[in-house]
Interface confidence: medium
């Protein structure tokens, strides 16, 4: 018979034959031949390979590393690589999230719209009209003014992006 | 000096409470973001609250979020938990830590020597 010229799926075309390929999680130790079966076996702790191969080497699992503010999120497999995010308060420089930067705190004038996660930064937001932030925090959000009426006082001094409103008494006019 | 020093922690039965305190000195505590993290044994670090300078902003790990209450008093430059419906895997030393506002291998930049808190029954 004719030698093949292509092979079915999960199977790889070696001298002239097709043999199987190692499943996800085995590397390949030697080609089948005419009379035996594709060896293969399995990755080492460390290592994986994620797809039908004929890879001989596995790969490392990735390495979180401490230094670079990564701890592993997911444990890595046979089949699946290392999943690294990072530490509370820092999130991933990219998808790959191969290091990570310091979330960034909100200046004053500015609240938290959104508080940072592992995969993004701190989300800010301008205080409106009405509002404030008189501090630099990765927590604070805009806060509103006092409401000096519901406290049967005035406006002495009114408020801006930064800092509240000072509430005084009410002048109160003799006869 | 920076200093955060904790102090409450015990040994709780399971259902029980405790309340956590740290007294910080060294720095302007009322315009410092403020956490609690902990590690249980053989565990890493795990964060479990955050808070805002002015302690109007808290936020909580679901593992402990309607359990758990974080405050402060910028009067007094003191940090609190209050842990209540305590858990065994609440089991852990629980650290209070300074939000980082520098870069640096950790988003804490100073934190306390811990108190342990055991609940078991």
């Known amino acids: 018979p004719e030698p093949p010229t292509a092979c079915r799926e999960k199977q790889y075309l070696i001298n002239s034959q097709c043999c199987s390929l190692c499943q996800p999680g085995q590397k390949l130790v030697s080609d089948c031949t005419e009379f035996t079966e594709t060896e293969c076996l399995p990755c080492g702790e460390s290592e994986f390979l994620d797809t039908w191969n004929r890879e001989t080497h596995c790969h490392q699992h990735k390495y979180c590393d401490p230094n670079l503010g990564l701890r592993v999120q997911q444990k890595g497999t046979s089949e699946t690589d290392t999943i690294c995010t990072c530490e509370e308060g820092w999130h991933c420089t990219s998808e790959a999230c191969e290091s990570c930067v310091l979330h960034r705190s909100c200046s004053p004038g500015f609240g938290v719209k959104q508080i940072a996660t592992g995969v993004s930064d701190t989300i800010c937001e301008p205080c409106p009209v009405g509002f404030f932030s008189n501090v630099s925090s990765a927590f604070e959000k805009c806060h509103p003014w006092t409401s000096c009426e519901t406290k049967d006082l005035v406006v002495q001094q009114a408020g801006t992006n930064k800092t509240d409103v000072v509430c005084g008494p009410q002048d109160r006019l003799r006869a | 000096e920076v200093q955060l020093l904790e102090s409450g922690g015990g040994l709780v039965q399971p259902g029980g409470s405790l309340r956590l305190s740290c007294a910080a000195s060294?720095?302007?505590?009322?315009?410092?973001?403020m956490q609690w993290v902990r590690q249980a044994p053989g565990k890493g670090l795990e964060w479990v609250s955050s808070?805002?300078?002015?302690?109007?902003?808290?936020y909580y790990a679901d593992s402990v979020k309607g359990r758990f209450t974080i405050s402060r008093d910028n009067s007094k430059n003191t940090l609190y938990l209050q842990m209540n419906s305590l858990r065994a895997e609440d089991t852990a030393v629980y650290y209070c830590?300074?939000?980082?506002?520098?870069?640096?291998?950790?988003?804490?930049?100073?934190w306390g020597q811990g108190t342990l808190v055991t609940v078991s029954s």
């Open positions: 830590a300074k939000h980082a506002s520098t870069e640096g291998p950790t988003a804490f930049d100073y």
């Open positions: 060294g720095f302007t505590f009322n315009v410092a973001d």
């Open positions: 808070i805002s300078p002015n302690g109007w902003d808290t």
